[in-house]
């Protein structure tokens, strides 16, 4: 759930998810458009393509809550949960792995970007 | 070869405490990933999951029994407990625990069930 | 929670007949199990994972389906399988058991 991102990506980033990332772009935080502003914005991109393809298989993606361990800078998703909060762990995890790969080209001026310039054709899944 | 057994009191009283022990043998609760889980089927009825307890101690329960339910473990004496409170006469039923391997999302071991008969 | 709706709820085979065993979840899983249980026994598992036999369980039966729907066959009944069979998922918490099939000898 949104509990489980907001604390693994803080523990990987080392950033504050509500101050850095949610908004961020065109697609980081609730919905998405347009064509994604920099990696970072991919990263979020890809993440929301991870949960529609969990929301079509009939996963709760923002109420299943999933157990992981933060451990070295890893992260490893507890296998003793149910299907729906397995998959929903390693969608998470890649986003914010993928958020961290990037923080070289993060921009502070796309926090908070107004949505109605994300424009272009929004990748497809 | 894996086993696991079942014990508990038979019959007691309506609003006592239901209390239930696993014995199990060829597997340790140590391993990551294993778990054991409790069952229970009426007579003549289906299954109904109860609880699972995991080898770091994470447990999970059924949403609808949660609050009266207690599931713990003696990993040196391969023995996982199940207590339930104020029993009624619906809780009458066989109780089984089964084994959940590493990675499954089944049980792949099952005891042989003890009989608990709940009397008003 | 997950319902899975099993039909019928009783049924009867003669020997070498096909049977077909249906279980239907309330939203979409990902895998289904199926176990056996014969009375005074316990359930063992028989199929994992929607088409995996369990050990030991004979080549006649069959496990398949997606989505919603899910089906274990018989492709010819003998008088040993003669037996209750429930579905279960653990696609999301809780885990959840089907109501069970009879499946009686003719």
């Known amino acids: 759930g949104i509990l489980n991102l907001n604390k693994m990506v803080k523990q990987v980033t080392g950033k504050m998810p509500i101050l850095s990332y949610w908004p961020y772009g065109c697609h980081c935080g609730l919905g998405g458009r347009g064509q994604p502003k920099d990696a970072t914005d991919w990263c979020c991109q890809t993440h929301d393509c991870c949960y529609d393809h969990l929301k079509t298989q009939g996963c709760s993606i923002y109420k299943d809550y999933y157990r992981y361990n933060f451990s070295q800078g890893n992260i490893h998703c507890s296998d003793k949960g149910s299907w729906c909060e397995q998959q929903l762990c390693a969608c998470d995890k890649e986003v914010a792995f993928c958020l961290k790969r990037n923080l070289d080209t993060y921009q502070k001026r796309l926090r908070f970007y107004w949505r109605p310039h994300c424009r272009g054709q929004t990748p497809g899944c | 070869q894996v086993t696991l057994k079942e014990s508990g009191p038979g019959i007691l009283q309506s609003s006592q405490t239901l209390s239930l022990t696993c014995s199990f043998s060829?597997?340790?609760?140590?391993?990551?990933?294993?778990?054991v889980g409790w069952i229970r089927q009426p007579s003549g009825k289906g299954l109904e999951w109860l609880a699972h307890?995991?080898?770091?101690?994470?447990?999970r329960y059924n949403p609808s029994l949660k609050s009266r339910l207690t599931i713990s473990k003696d990993t040196s004496r391969n023995q996982v407990f199940l207590k339930i409170t104020s029993v009624d006469t619906t809780d009458t039923a066989t109780y089984y625990c089964a084994r959940r391997g590493p990675g499954t999302w089944y049980f792949d071991v099952w005891g042989t069930g003890t009989t608990v008969t709940v009397s008003s | 929670q997950i319902v899975l709706t099993q039909s019928p709820a009783i049924m009867s085979a003669s020997p070498g007949e096909k049977v077909t065993i249906s279980c239907s979840a309330s939203?979409?899983?990902?895998?289904m199990y199926w176990y056996q249980q014969k009375p005074g026994s316990s359930p063992k598992p028989w199929i994992y994972r929607t088409s995996n036999l369990a050990s030991g369980v004979p080549a006649r039966f069959s496990g398949s389906g997606s989505g919603t729907s899910y089906s274990l066959t018989i492709s010819s009944m003998e008088a040993e399988d003669a037996a209750a069979y429930y579905c279960?998922?653990?696609?999301?918490?809780?885990?959840?058991f089907g109501a069970g099939t009879k499946l009686e000898l003719k």
């Open positions: 060829g597997f340790s609760l140590t391993t990551s990933g294993m778990g």
């Open positions: 279960q998922q653990y696609h999301s918490s809780p885990l959840t």
């Open positions: 307890i995991y080898w770091d101690d994470d447990k």
């Open positions: 939203s979409s899983v990902s895998y």
